[in-house]
Interface confidence: low
């Protein structure tokens, strides 16, 4: 382990859910540290996670500036001897550029995964049930406020509701491009619900995992004649 050779990062992977975005890579460092750079296609490189011994870098703050941009990222492997504290340059004593590895390009609006949704509430009025999906907050900002998933995706985002009688396994579905469903139910029957977020226009990462199941007769629901 006395070697001073640096090892280029590999297995660069974007992990992104609801725009919370982390770049991960291998290997754990020996005799070296890492620095990450990110840029848009037309912008300058910005350095993040200076001289880290970790194998991940949270780039959320950068990508939420414009989630419809395309981002490039790269991971530099820096010899420990060149990473003295307070040194602002990435480069060694002779000015050579340390080895780096490029991540695949990342388009947050297209590539971030949809987080597991949550059923906020359901309310029965006669033979109708109104099911409301929680509009999850993201880390995307506009005018100093955090936008919700619906704010960001608008009508690109739909929800699919799966519902069934507690006494049977036959599922029905409903869809909405708001965060609410109004469905018909049989009076006197208890129903269970689960929702899934979907962006139909995508080719990958189209669907979230299903929400936890909520059933009538539990605390989240209300019943009114």
């Amino acid at each position: 382990s006395g070697t001073t050779n640096t090892v280029a990062a590999y297995n660069l992977t974007w992990k992104s859910t609801n725009f919370k975005t982390i770049l991960e890579w291998e290997p754990k460092p020996v005799n070296q540290v890492y620095t990450v750079q990110i840029s848009t296609k037309s912008g300058d490189w910005k350095s993040k996670c200076f001289y880290t011994t970790d194998t991940e870098c949270d780039l959320t703050d950068e990508i939420v500036k414009d989630v419809k941009q395309t981002y490039l990222a790269r991971v530099f492997s820096v010899p420990w001897r060149n990473s003295t504290h307070g040194k602002e340059t990435l480069f060694g004593t002779h000015g050579e550029e340390p080895p780096f590895t490029n991540a695949r390009k990342f388009l947050p609006y297209r590539d971030t995964k949809l987080g597991q949704p949550t059923i906020q509430s359901f309310e029965q009025v006669g033979t109708k049930v109104n099911v409301t999906v929680e509009d999850e907050r993201t880390l995307v900002r506009r005018n100093n406020t955090f936008l919700s998933l619906r704010d960001v995706f608008g009508k690109d985002l739909i929800y699919t509701l799966y519902y069934w009688k507690s006494s049977s396994s036959g599922k029905k579905t409903a869809k909405t491009n708001t965060n609410e469903f109004l469905i018909d139910v049989d009076k006197g029957e208890n129903y269970c619900f689960s929702v899934q977020a979907v962006i139909p226009s995508r080719t990958v990462n189209r669907k979230s995992t299903d929400s936890p199941v909520e059933c009538m007769g539990q605390e989240k629901g209300e019943f009114r004649e």
């Epitope: 754990k28 020996v30 991940e56």
Partner: antibody
Framework: QVQLQQWGAGLLKPSETLSLTCAVY????????WSWIRQPPGKGLEWIGE???????RYNPSLKSRVTISVDTSKNQFSLKLSSVTAADTAVYYC??????????????????WGKGTTVTVSS | EIVLTQSPGTLSLSPGERATLSCRAS???????LAWYQQKPGQAPRLLIY???SRANGIPDRFSGSGSGTDFTLTISRLEPEDFAVYYC?????????FGGGTKVEIK
């Protein structure tokens, strides 16, 4: 002096989910990896997985489909969940700190602080 | 997966004797990632050696580590009564991190 205190249910039925938590006292989560290791009765040690302070995880492929390790920096603790347990999951479960240590020109990784262990028995 | 094979499985020795424990890897292991642990009954493992050679804080100098590549050795130069325990080698360079099966050092 960093200490790890762990707790969780000790007796489970098959198909239930094992849930253990490890709290870090006297130090920070930041800058380290945090591991879970288990030891079946009378057998050797098996690494389950680890998590960095910012949430990145590595899991043992043999358990990956059933394991979730999470971190709560506000409480200075990390947790293990193992779903669909069977009798084969009966073991003493340890949490440990995996330290990246710089010494004489190199990085070394080793588990230098361990919890006392939690005995988990899976039985119907 | 890197398999670590420890030998012998059991070592029967008397206090004052020298103990030599072997750890063989199925694939090359960077010595930076090779550690040795001691475990006594009912206790958690305790770090002895990291980076194949370096003693952890508070570990007496009768414990030493050596080796590289696929062959590593833990040596206890003169066994003390408190040294009778199970010893494990571990690699933390390749996922899954693996431990050897252990060597039990028992009193003869």
């Amino acid at each position: 002096q960093v200490q790890l205190q762990q707790w969780g249910a000790g007796l489970l039925k098959p198909s239930e989910t094992l849930s253990l938590t490890c709290a870090v006292y006297g130090g920070s989560l930041s800058g380290y990896y945090w591991s879970w290791i288990r030891q079946p009765p009378g057998k050797g040690l098996e690494w389950i997985g680890e998590i960095g302070a910012s949430g990145s995880t590595r899991y043992n492929p043999s358990l990956k489909s059933r394991v979730t390790i999470s971190v709560d920096t506000s409480k200075n603790q990390f947790s293990l969940k193992l779903s669909s347990v069977t009798a084969a999951d009966t073991a003493v479960y340890y949490c440990a700190r995996d330290t990246p240590y710089y010494y004489e020109g190199g990085y070394y990784y080793y588990m230098d602080v361990w919890g006392k262990g939690t005995t988990v028995t899976v039985s119907s | 997966e890197i398999v670590l094979t420890q030998s012998p499985g059991t070592l029967s020795l008397s206090p004052g004797e020298r103990a030599t424990l072997s750890c063989r890897a199925s694939d090359s292991v960077d010595s930076s990632y090779l550690a040795w642990y001691q475990q006594k009954p009912g206790q958690a493992p305790r770090l002895l050696i990291y980076g194949a050679f370096s003693r952890a804080n508070g570990i007496p100098d009768r414990f030493s580590g050596s080796g590289s590549g696929t062959d590593f050795t833990l040596t206890i130069s003169r066994l003390e009564p408190e040294d009778f325990a199970v010893y494990y080698c571990q690699q933390a360079g390749v996922v899954p991190y693996t431990f050897g099966g252990g060597t039990k050092v028992e009193i003869k």
